[in-house]
């Protein structure tokens, strides 16, 4: 129950990629506004997105403080123009989000192949180490900094002239693969966190092929 014409938020959903984290909910407000609070299991509630008519709230700044913590958010509903009003129990109407642990649940963003370099029959393929919004000592950490060896990359590669794919793995951001001399190859990578049970894999990177500008060739 709540103040007349005020409805509780529902379908609270965490949308998170590479730790950029937004809480979304419904419904679109009609004569009401929302405020979001977030806390860790043992922490105090912190208010964000005060009296907003949006149905999303960027909570990245809060979750990046400790990505291994489990967070809970709640969305309060207030009548527009009367934000002091409370529900019949003397409390504003609110709804809790599911729990969210960024380290275990943030989606892995689509990776990018930064470069590839051929030296004879070897090709070194480098995956861009994407910067996240997680900070340590006032510097932004990369995805590899955050996940360490928990994060692996799977490389798919194939001759431009054929459809038969090969694969290799790395727990760094570099692959060194054997290729046939004089053949052009195409590459695509996927990020994976093997220890996870959800959101384990990214989408594949865009395909990059030899003979295009990202590559270098040396005899």
């Amino acid at each position: 129950s709540g103040t007349t014409n005020t409805v509780a938020a529902y379908n609270l959903t965490w949308k998170s990629t590479n730790f950029k984290t937004i809480l979304e909910w419904e419904p679109k407000p009609v004569n009401q506004v929302y405020t979001v609070q977030i806390s860790t299991k043992s922490g105090d509630w912190k208010s964000k997105c005060f009296y907003t008519t949006d149905t999303e709230c960027d909570l990245t700044d809060e979750i990046v403080k400790d990505v291994k913590q489990t967070y809970l958010a709640r969305v309060f509903s207030y009548p527009a123009g009367n934000v002091e009003s409370t529900g019949s129990a003397g409390e504003p109407l609110y709804e809790n989000s599911p729990e969210f642990t960024p380290y275990l649940e943030t989606n892995l963003g689509q990776p990018t192949i930064q470069s590839f370099e051929q030296v004879g029959t070897k090709v070194n393929v480098t995956v861009e180490d994407e910067r996240t919004l997680v900070r340590r000592n006032n510097t932004f950490l990369s995805l590899r900094d955050v996940f360490g060896k928990d994060l692996i990359y799977t490389l798919y590669y194939w001759k431009s002239s054929s459809s038969g794919k090969k694969t290799a793995k790395t727990n760094t951001n570099e692959f060194l693969i054997d290729v046939d001399k004089g053949e052009n190859y195409c590459f695509s990578v996927q990020a994976v966190i093997p220890s996870r049970t959800v959101n384990r894999k990214s989408t594949d990177s865009p395909v990059e092929c030899m003979g295009q500008e990202k590559g270098e060739f040396r005899e």
């Epitope: 727990n171 093997p194 384990r200 894999k201």
Partner: antibody, heavy 117, light 107 residues
Framework: EVQLVESGGGLVQPGGSLRLSCAAS????????MHWVRQAPGKGLEWVGW????????IYDPKFQDRFTISADTSKNTAYLQMNSLRAEDTAVYYC??????????WGQGTLVTVSS | DIQMTQSPSSLSASVGDRVTITCKAS??????LSWYQQKPGKAPKLLIY???SGKRGVPSRFSGSGSGTDFTLTISSLQPEDFATYYC?????????FGQGTKVEIK
């Protein structure tokens, strides 16, 4: 509970075809890589190939590339191995396995394929 | 392709013995090696993976070590239920390859 159940094995004549199925339960196959591994009677394990069911990427041991095709139907949570132009030396127990990208953590019970006239 | 040479192909041991099985890769596979146990008529079972970690539920007497080209599976004190065939698998690059297997028999 995670389970993989293979089916579709049996007796087939040389030159014939067979489609094996690997029905998964307790997890979503699109979150993992799925492999086929075979074992000839009294012999060791031999890797056939893999599929990423989410995007359809397939990788094969080159010796199987021309005759075997791995596919998946995520709506049925099932992976498949289509085997064509079968030979006597393809007689084996065929296993499917789930791959976390670090190890094969669950295997099916296997299905026996016998190629004989 | 990467070849995996597993040795010995078979061994006889007694309950309580320490058993060591080795796998040698034809080139560097970093830590992309896992070990499996198979009993007759059954599917293989994961024992050890990725830098020597053991699967939950696998007894602590099983341990793995090695990186690069040389890997070892050790059973610190062989139990009756450990008589089986053991396989290593490299999954660092395709085609993935198994070792030939080591059959551990009762002496």
């Amino acid at each position: 509970e995670v389970q993989l159940v293979e089916s579709g094995g049996g007796l087939v004549q040389p030159g014939g075809s067979l489609r094996l199925s690997c029905a998964a339960s307790g997890f979503n196959i699109k979150d993992y890589y799925m492999h086929w591994v075979r074992q000839a009677p009294g012999k060791g394990l031999e890797w056939v190939g893999w599929i990423d069911p989410e995007n359809g990427n397939t990788i094969y041991d080159p010796k199987f590339q021309d005759r075997f095709t791995i596919s998946a139907d995520t709506s049925k949570n099932t992976a498949y191995l289509q085997m064509n132009s079968l030979r006597a030396e393809d007689t084996a127990v065929y296993y499917c396995a789930r791959d976390t990208a670090a190890y094969f953590d669950y295997w099916g019970q296997g299905t026996l394929v016998t190629v004989s006239s | 392709d990467i070849q995996m040479t597993q040795s010995p192909s078979s061994l006889s041991a007694s309950v309580g013995d320490r058993v060591t099985i080795t796998c040698k890769a034809s080139r560097d596979i970093k830590s992309y090696l896992s070990w499996y146990q198979q009993k007759p008529g059954k599917a293989p079972k994961l024992l050890i993976y990725y830098e020597g970690s053991g699967k939950r539920g696998v007894p602590s007497r099983f341990s793995g070590s090695g990186s690069g080209t040389d890997f070892t599976l050790t059973i610190s004190s062989l139990q009756p239920e450990d008589f089986a065939t053991y396989y290593c698998l490299q999954h660092g690059e395709s085609p993935f390859t198994f070792g030939q297997g080591t059959k551990v028999e009762i002496k």
